[in-house]
Amino acid sequence: TEVKVTQPEKSVSVAAGDSTILNCTVTSLLPVGPIRWYRGVGQSRLLIYSFTGEHFPRIRNVSDTTKRNNMDFSIRISNVTPEDAGTYYCVKFQRGSSEPDTEIQSGGGTEVYVLAK
């Protein structure tokens, strides 16, 4: 059965300087491959967070993603700024064999609105 990626919130609003959580769950970890968060779509999309061990300032995972059966890939963005506004996508990849990972499923997206303090 094909993996499903669920982003339950269509949109969230957050005051500048506050934190917000973007929720994402998957129905399967197979095929093996990373899960990454992006802002925007297409060529201009920006990598926001990758669950592959790198450090991303202001962003951290919410659940224990070192659990071998973890299906929750939600993230918390701290100290939100107006530049963080946009639509965020949680994307499941299948690892590539000697080529780049292949995107196999994306969540429906969560729009982040940043409110002035």
Epitope: L30, V32, T52, D64, T65, T66, K67, R68, N69, S97
Partner: antibody, heavy 117, light 108 residues
């Protein structure tokens, strides 16, 4: 620099117990999954057990029920409680740090456990 | 679970290319790594996540995969590369780590 230092090995009789420790430094221990891997004299590597940063545990088939992995994130120490030891448990025991996808990137020097009557 | 199969031994002359294969995993659910172990020493990770080389490992070590077979390639082998090499796998279906039986690399 990442450092993993095992201790607690020694000579015990069949049926006895032993607790191994692995002191970690040079990285954020509380954020990483960890494992124990053993190697019997003249033999290959065998995965024993793994533990997530939040202490979910996983075991190899040969040790289920007799060996217990645990951790103390406040002390940066990984443990392996070994009960009802048999001669087949004689090995060098290594602690290893897990990558995001549960392979191993850093290893300790190992501690030798000898079970003999 | 599954078994990973490696050749017991591989021999190569200095400066030549050594290739060590590992088969038996399911590419759909398994990630692979390669571990080097010299006599009396702890293992050292030379490749993880199929083809990722830790920063302190020489560039002559590389990993690749094709179907259910993964390969460790050592280009321009040096005498210091003589060691046992273990293929390791993590199976995302069973949550289990497995090792191959090891390959003894001899530098002639």
């Amino acid at each position: 620099d990442v450092q993993l230092v095992e201790s607690g090995g020694g000579v015990v009789r069949p049926g006895e117990s032993l607790r191994l420790s692995c002191e970690a430094s040079g990285f954020t221990f509380s954020s990483n999954a960890m494992s124990w891997v053993r190697q019997a004299p003249g033999k290959g590597l065998e995965w024993v057990a793994g533990i997530s940063s939040g202490s979910d545990t996983y075991y190899g088939d040969s040790v289920k029920g007799r060996l217990t992995i645990s951790r103390d994130n406040s002390k940066n120490i990984l443990y392996l409680q070994m009960n009802s030891l048999t001669a087949e448990d004689t090995a060098v025991y290594y602690c290893a740090r897990e990558t995001w996808n549960h392979l191993f990137d850093y290893w300790g020097l190992g501690t030798l456990v000898t079970v003999s009557s | 679970s599954y078994e990973l199969t490696q050749p017991p031994s591989v021999s190569v002359s200095p400066g030549q290319t050594a290739r060590i294969t590992c088969s038996g995993g399911d590419y759909y659910s398994t990630y692979y790594a390669w571990y080097q172990q010299k006599p009396g020493q702890a293992p050292v990770t030379v490749i993880h996540s199929d083809d990722k080389r830790p920063s302190d490992i020489p560039e002559r070590f590389s990993g690749s995969s094709s179907g259910t077979t993964v390969t460790l390639t050592i280009s321009g082998v040096q005498a210091e590369d003589e060691a046992d090499y273990y293929c390791g796998g993590y199976d995302g279906r069973t949550y289990i780590n497995t090792f191959g039986g090891g390959t003894k690399l001899t530098v002639l």
